[in-house]
């Protein structure tokens, strides 16, 4: 179920997955929520005396049991990922942090009159992930009212330092507030030759596009279908970027599909989950568990309810079926995507819906007639 | 068009712009409306980009710079390239486009008449070539549709000018001995029309030339009269296929 409480002065021991810098515990929790494997986190709001570089450290953790031993640590805040908290799921982070310098690669500096204007500049710049604004009281006159647009390979600051009269924050692209525009085009038979930032295995170009949308540095992608000539690249989704923010003219390539990240979209922004169940397909990965259920939909539901499950394969092979149903293999991987996709007539595969938002509809399913 | 002048809106209502929408959108070729759902153009326009879904077809347009993402366009339902067209040769440079949805005819967007098979030997005297192509060999696409009047050149004479090529009877040539007026890059697939017995006819499809508007190097066009059977057969067989797939 959904565990949203935070534990003050508590640090989870072990289970370390990754460490990043975040300005507060709420942002750390968000980062954990959208990390493919993170279930628990610990955030250091206060630095240990000798380890000043650990302050603002966000330690993402996993656990087979879903819990880790807690130790007392002053200034530490710990909690759970919100992976199963449908209505609370949002990548949007609007908070502004006064007195903090969120450091990263400064790629643009310009004068602006307000923090809001600076945040808007960041939101409307394709490369900007976070920003720092120097107020009119900043100690160096030449930097006063300067807006620094920043980025990093992880999408989060490379370090965070307290500095008076600096204000930092994040791009609001994830809040669907960008005015850049949103190219929905999908180019069949075309490939982009630009720089690859990462690659994942996906069953189709639409999943590839969603993965690209939620990757911090992916601006566009090329997906190679199952018919692609190079076996090792079949069903591979290449996440790409470029200095200009635009792809170079696409190259004609049979069995390739290309398109753009939808992270700058206002209305068409996808959810970080994939509803479709792919029949005749098997997703390979680390085995988490296997149960016997009636149908692929039930298998998807089981995967969704199992917090560590990222994707599943449901097998209809005679040897995989019993009276209570057929084999539902719950699986996971380091990046949340299958390690390999194979085509098997008796298989159906899909993804956990743990990161899907629960839509609270105002239109009731059951209508109550007024008296 | 080299040596041409600006056209006015509705002057050549059969002229369409074939554009490719990839990272950016660009005018690639011209074409001619020959029916509510049919465009006639050059096969070579699709070399390397034979994918219907990236093409956008704009009719009733005079100025390309006025096209925005709100401008309505037609999409390709079916692309029919002549079965004998080869990328390594210059013959059979003809293609038919079936549109996803039929066009509404207006005074700015309507079809051009096709010649009859009997017109293969007709002598035309009032012929015009139109397009948004380059106005010089190393030029750029034009915003406003250009037009130029151009005399036809007999095939025997044309063959003498093009000793390294085969000028077949399915080609027709047009140009001035001294050069100066011709179709150019970006005009491909567009119409060479001639007024005959009071009506405009689609005599040629802009195909190729050695450079543009060079002296003694006429433009070479696909001779439409030689392909009437092919055009009618393809349109008919497409209709029959549509009947087969329509609900009972």
């Amino acid at each position: 179920g959904c565990l949203s409480q935070l534990y003050a002065n508590t640090f989870f021991r072990g289970g370390d997955l990754a460490a990043i810098y975040t300005p507060d515990a709420q942002h750390c929790q968000k980062m954990c929520t959208f990390h493919p494997r993170c279930l628990l986190f610990s955030f250091l709001a206060v630095s240990p005396t000798k380890e000043t570089d650990k302050r603002f450290g966000c330690f993402m953790k996993e656990s087979i049991t879903g819990t880790l031993p807690r130790i007392h640590r002053t200034g530490a805040i710990s909690g759970h990922s919100l992976k199963q908290c449908g209505h609370q799921l949002s990548a949007c982070h609007q908070d502004i942090y006064e007195g903090l310098d969120m450091r990263g690669s400064n790629f643009n500096i310009s004068k602006t009159d307000s923090i809001e204007e600076c945040q808007k500049l960041c939101t409307n710049n394709i490369h900007c992930q976070f920003f720092t604004y120097a107020t009119k009281a900043f100690h160096r006159p030449e930097y006063r009212k300067s807006c620094l647009l920043k980025r990093s390979s992880s999408g989060t600051p490379t370090s965070i330092k307290p500095v008076d009269n600096l204000v930092s924050g994040f791009s609001l692209k994830s809040c669907a507030l960008s005015e850049i525009g949103c190219p929905m085009d999908i180019f069949q038979h075309f490939a982009f030759a630009d720089l690859n930032v990462s690659q994942v295995v996906t069953p189709d170009a639409f999943v590839c596009r969603t993965v690209c949308t939620f990757h911090p540095n992916c601006l566009f992608f090329t997906f190679y279908t199952n018919e692609w000539e190079t076996e090792s690249q079949r069903n591979v989704c290449f996440l790409k970027t470029s200095k200009s923010g635009r792809p170079s003219p696409p190259i004609i390539q049979e069995n390739a599909v290309s398109g753009y990240s939808l992270f700058t979209c206002r209305k068409a922004r996808p959810e970080p989950c994939h509803f479709k169940i792919y029949s005749g397909v098997a997703f390979e990965g680390e085995e988490l568990n296997a149960t016997f259920v009636q149908g692929a939909d039930a298998c998807q539901e089981t995967c969704t309810k199992t917090i560590r499950c990222q994707f599943f394969t449901y097998s209809l092979l005679p040897q995989d079926c019993k009276a209570e149903g057929c084999k539902c293999s719950l699986r996971l991987s380091t990046d949340g995507s299958p390690t390999r996709i194979t085509y098997e007539a008796q298989g159906s595969s899909g993804y956990s819906l743990r990161l899907c938002k629960v839509v609270e509809s105002s239109d009731c399913t059951t209508k109550i007639n007024a008296r | 068009i080299v040596g041409g002048t600006n056209s006015s809106l509705g002057e050549w209502p059969w002229q369409v712009s074939l554009q490719v929408k990839l990272v950016s959108q660009n005018h690639m070729c011209g074409g001619s409306i020959i029916g509510r759902q049919w465009i006639l153009t050059a096969a070579h326009c699709f070399d390397g980009i034979p994918y219907p879904d990236v093409w956008r077809i704009y009719g009733g347009i005079l100025n390309l710079s006025e096209i925005t993402n709100k401008t309505p366009f037609s999409s390709i339902k079916e692309l029919i390239i002549h079965q004998k067209y080869k990328m390594s040769e210059g013959s059979y440079d003809i293609a038919l486009i079936k549109l996803q949805t039929p066009l509404n005819y207006t005074e700015f967007q309507k079809p051009i008449c096709l010649p009859s098979k009997a017109d293969t030997n007709t002598i035309y005297t009032n012929c015009w070539v139109t397009g948004w192509g380059y106005t010089k060999e190393r030029g750029e696409t034009q915003n406003i549709l250009q037009k130029a009047t151009i005399p036809l050149v007999p095939n025997e004479e044309c063959q003498k000018k093009y000793r390294d090529y085969v000028i077949t009877k399915q080609m027709i040539c047009a140009g001035y001995k001294e050069g100066g007026i011709d179709a150019c890059k970006g005009d491909s697939g567009g119409p060479l029309v001639c007024k005959h017995s009071g009506r405009w006819q689609l005599v040629g499809i802009t195909s190729w030339g050695e450079g543009c508007a060079r002296k003694e190097q006429p433009g070479v066009y696909t001779k439409v009269a030689e392909y009437i059977d092919w055009i009618l057969e393809k349109i008919q067989s497409s209709k029959e296929r549509a009947l087969e797939t329509s609900p009972a």
Partner: antibody, heavy 125, light 108 residues
Framework: EVQLLESGGGLVQPGGSLRLSCAAS????????MTWVRQAPGKGLEWVSY????????IYADSVKGRFTISRDNSKNTLYLQMNSLRAEDTAVYYC??????????????????WGQGTLVTVSS | EIVLTQSPGTLSLSPGERATLSCRTS???????LAWYQQKPGQAPRLLIY???SRATGIPDRFSGSGSGTDFTLTISRLEPEDFAVYYC?????????FGQGTKVEIK
């Protein structure tokens, strides 16, 4: 399947003559411009001559002009290169090639899409 | 005549690396008339790229051509063992038709 097969190469003394043939199959020979290209031992490629589809137009490299004659017999699907007054520097592998001439952006393209396997001509005393 | 200058003369690379071959022409060449060929020892040349950037039939997409005017480039995105050979650019924009002197791509 397009095929080009050269023959007629061999050893010849300086000042001598040789006639190379290239038998073509798998395409409409009379529609294509044809060319000869040569390659001296250990050296790069050198264009020699071309002939128009009808055979009425020929062009030569300066190094062979007046000594070599290109011709074709469209009824036999054969290309020829008559080489007279041969010199030591004419020693090379001679290739015949088909010149593809498609259309792109209202201009023609030109490239050698099919090549023969080559025939060696050695000019030596 | 139009002189084609290829550089470098020799390129020593390992399989998997990217190869960039340059071809400069002494006069403007219409890109429709520029081609690239590959030749292996004892074999006839093979057409790779025509019209400066169009891949010939059957040529793997790791080969790509670009350029216009007087500067043309052949790129092999990831060298395979079978790509080690001599590469020639050629123009047929003006007679006499001419070839570049070739670039040898050898195993490092």
């Amino acid at each position: 399947e397009v095929q080009l097969l050269e023959s007629g190469g061999g050893l010849v003394q300086p000042g001598g003559s040789l006639r190379l043939s290239c038998a073509a199959s798998g395409f409409t020979f009379s529609h294509y411009l044809m060319t000869w290209v040569r390659q001296a031992p250990g050296k790069g490629l050198e264009w020699v001559s071309y002939i128009s589809p009808s055979g009425g137009h020929t062009i030569y490299a300066d190094s062979v002009k007046g000594r070599f004659t290109i011709s074709r017999d469209n009824s036999k699907n054969t290309l020829y290169l008559q080489m007279n007054s041969l010199r030591a520097e004419d020693t090379a592998v001679y290739y015949c090639a088909r010149v593809a001439r498609g259309i792109a952006a209202r201009s023609r393209t030109s490239y050698f899409d099919y090549w023969g396997q080559g025939t060696l001509v050695t000019v030596s005393s | 005549e139009i002189v084609l200058t290829q550089s470098p003369g020799t390129l020593s690379l390992s399989p998997g690396e990217r190869a960039t071959l340059s071809c400069r022409t002494s006069q403007f060449v219409n890109s429709n008339y520029l081609a690239w060929y590959q030749q292996k020892p004892g074999q006839a040349p093979r057409l790779l790229i025509y019209g400066a950037s169009s891949r010939a039939t059957g040529i793997p997409d790791r080969f790509s051509g670009s350029g216009s005017g007087t500067d043309f480039t052949l790129t092999i995105s990831r060298l395979e063992p079978e790509d080690f050979a001599v590469y020639y650019c050629q123009q047929s924009s003006r007679t006499p038709w001419t070839f570049g002197q070739g670039t040898k791509v050898e195993i490092k």
